[in-house]
Interface confidence: medium
């Protein structure tokens, strides 16, 4: 037989299929010009010493073969003895290691079999009603195709699926979308309506992320509040490595997971902007406020579930940075100004109450006064900090209040609201004899003592009702007892106690009269 012809003789090897897993597959035959034809196939397994034979059976029942040697592609003309206008059945037999391996058969009319391309170029992937939609431009001059897909996950083998017939300039396919694992897809096409036409090669892999992006495994740490009233948020991040199918490993566009950081500033609720989203790589500086921090993972299908952490407020207090003056018209606070044109947020809440009860006020942008101070005033009618109780005050500052990451803490301190001088007056003052010339004076702690740093000192006043002489004794704010000595027996005294703050003198308690009994010796 001539090499250019199909040889109508028995092939030069025994006729027996070994049934092994390796062997020839994916046989495709098509017309490549007006009178030339090509068949190509894949061979799976060791290729050394393998000889391939393209077998062909005509409709009459006569069969022939082409010897292809070690090649997996063979061309022939319409004069090679194979009928091109009628249906023929073709398959490949590979002779290797004293055994024959056969490919599946294809039955087709060669003249009408056109070489179809797989989807070429950009395959667009989108989500549609919980399924995956793939779309691509139909290859030139190839409108009208059947399309199949195959897909696999990192832990499952290829599964075949059908996209149905296509008859347009763009083709599309609906495929299953996995919730939590990445998938690799490949597509192939063949001529529509042509009896037994060959499938194209499989397309390049299309890598598709899971519908739900993986949650990042992250930990946050927050540095101490600096002199500038800001603290660095740092991230210990181990983003979940998405397991990828074999064809998607390495560079797999489409499966990328991006992480965003969403900050929610819980303090100062009266500010304009409470949340801001940042690139995870841009770790921000925060004020000393309380925050919720969420890490949002997202892929091409959009954001996934949040993972949220709470960053508590920095409770370090500045005992003297805030001056408060109480006048007849109201109250004014003074503190060292940060810079020109700063907006301040003054936040207060009763001590011991839920953080959700914080109240705040936003100032208009203000410059420092001549003494370098910033101020905030409120009238008694406003009701701000009007109750006679302890308040925790925090002042935040920003040159750009709409940019969440630009707030800083100016100070945190405690303040006793309402008429503090009267409310702080010590009660239950009692006098007990201590010795022949001294007494012990005790009193119940002032309400001001519930407010850290507010009570500066107690002052105990003793008045000699005979001589009208008065002595005053300062007492540490942590003490509620003092010994008055150098007293004279039989003389009437009155004692009073007051509680002073740094900015306010307290109101004296009710006078308590006492005298030391004259000791009569026997």
């Amino acid at each position: 037989c001539r090499t250019s012809e199909c040889c109508f003789q028995d092939p030069p090897y025994p006729d027996a299929d070994s049934g092994s897993a390796s062997g020839p597959r994916d046989l495709r035959c098509y017309r490549i010009s007006s009178d030339r034809y090509e068949c190509s196939w894949q061979y799976e397994g060791p290729t050394a010493g393998v000889s391939h034979f393209l077998r062909c059976c005509l409709s009459s029942g006569r069969c022939c073969y082409f010897a292809a040697g070690s090649a997996t592609r063979l061309q022939f003309s319409d004069q090679a003895g194979v009928s091109v206008l009628y249906t023929v059945t073709l398959w490949v037999e590979s002779w290797a290691r004293n055994q024959t391996e056969k490919s599946p058969e294809v039955t087709l009319q060669l003249y009408n079999s056109v070489k179809y391309e797989p989807p070429l170029g950009d395959i667009k992937v989108s989500k549609l009603a919980g399924q995956l939609r793939m779309e691509w431009e139909t290859p030139d001059n190839q409108v009208g195709a059947e399309v199949q897909f195959r897909h696999r996950t990192p832990s499952s083998p290829w599964k075949l699926g059908d996209c149905g017939p296509q008859d347009d300039d763009t083709e599309s396919c609906l495929c299953p979308l996995e919730m939590n694992v990445a998938q690799e897809f490949q597509l192939r096409r063949r001529q529509l309506g042509s009896q037994g036409s060959s499938w194209s090669k499989w397309s390049s892999p299309v890598c598709v992320p899971p519908e739900n992006p993986p949650q990042p495994q992250v930990r946050f740490s927050v540095e101490q509040l600096g002199q500038d009233g800001r603290r660095r948020l740092t991230l210990k991040e181990q983003p979940t490595q998405l397991e990828l199918p074999e064809g998607c490993q390495g560079l797999a566009p489409g499966t990328e997971v991006t992480y965003r950081l969403q900050l929610h500033m819980l303090s100062c609720p009266c500010k304009a902007k409470a949340t801001r989203t940042l690139h995870l790589g841009k770790m921000p500086y925060l004020s000393g406020a309380a925050y919720n921090v969420a890490v949002i993972s997202s892929n091409q299908f959009g954001p996934g579930l949040n993972q949220t952490w709470h960053i508590p407020a920095d409770t370090h207090t500045e005992p003297v940075a805030l001056n408060i003056s109480v006048g007849t018209n109201g109250t004014t606070m003074y503190w060292p100004a940060r810079a020109q044109s700063m907006t301040y947020c003054i936040e207060w809440q009763p001590v011991g109450q839920d953080g959700g009860l914080a109240t705040c006020s936003l100032t208009a942008p203000q410059d420092p006064d001549p003494a370098g101070m910033a101020t905030y005033s409120w009238s008694r009618e406003s009701g701000a900090m009007g109750q006679e109780k302890c308040y925790y005050i925090t002042i935040f500052a920003s040159a750009h209040p709409e940019k969440l990451t630009l707030w800083s803490t100016v100070l945190s301190t405690y303040h006793f609201g309402g008429n503090a001088s009267a409310a702080g007056t010590p009660h239950h003052v009692s006098v007990k004899n201590h010795s022949l010339d001294s007494v012990s004076v005790d009193w119940a702690p002032s309400l001001l003592s519930t407010c850290p740093g507010v009570l500066k000192e107690y002052v105990v006043r003793c008045r000699d009702e005979d001589s009208k002489q008065v002595s005053e004794h300062p007492v540490q704010p942590t003490e509620t007892q003092v010994t008055l000595s150098g007293l004279r027996a039989g003389v009437a005294y009155t004692v009073q106690v007051r509680a002073d703050t740094a900015w306010l003198r307290g109101v004296w308690s009710q006078p308590q009269r006492f005298s030391i009994e004259v000791q009569v010796s026997d």
Partner: antibody
Framework: QVQLVESGGGVVQPGRSLRLSCAAS????????MSWVRQAPGKGLEWVAG????????EYADSVKGRFTISRDNSKNTLYLQMNSLRAEDTAVYYC??????????????WGRGTLVTVSS | AIQMTQSPSSLSASVGDRVTITCRAS??????LAWYQQKPGKAPKLLIY???SLQSGVPSRFSGSGSGTDFTLTISSLQPEDFATYYC?????????FGQGTKVEIK
Amino acid sequence: QVQLVESGGGVVQPGRSLRLSCAASGFTFTSYGMSWVRQAPGKGLEWVAGISYSGSDTEYADSVKGRFTISRDNSKNTLYLQMNSLRAEDTAVYYCARSPDYIIDYGFDYWGRGTLVTVSS
Amino acid sequence: AIQMTQSPSSLSASVGDRVTITCRASQGISSDLAWYQQKPGKAPKLLIYDASSLQSGVPSRFSGSGSGTDFTLTISSLQPEDFATYYCQQYWIYPFTFGQGTKVEIK
């Protein structure tokens, strides 16, 4: 591929209103912040307004605050700019631009071709 | 609002030249700066974001640097398709603002 197509421009008298639309395709619209940027004839670029991915946050340039409203319909993949009380100085090509993030705090990675708004009596 | 000042306003250069455009912010903007290229009758195109990150698909002859208030766009070897107007833009604070533009013309 990503496509942004503006429409709704035209000639309008001062004081009147106009609504611009921007149809987005080729990407997951609900995952991106969007903005409007304008360019007066022969002049530079001016950012007009921006909106976050969900529509919850909006921002405006001082020159349009109180007159223009940016909004989005995520079900229609469409961005809008409602322009009221138009002035001659609002005459410009208006571009729709995508932010490469959920919010609008970054540059703009995709732009439409623009639609011309002429405010003239 | 933050003022963005570009210099020069225009420049003439030849193919193969190294071109540098600067942008100065009226206050610190960290690295929240983008550079765009615009050709007549076309929409702007993002070249650089975060002051120095090259946008995907942009040739590596474009580079950006700077932080705070002073920023630079460099074209290492000018190509015929690079003749255009270039804008910087800050996105540190609202309202976002652009520079007035630098026109790069053929010498």
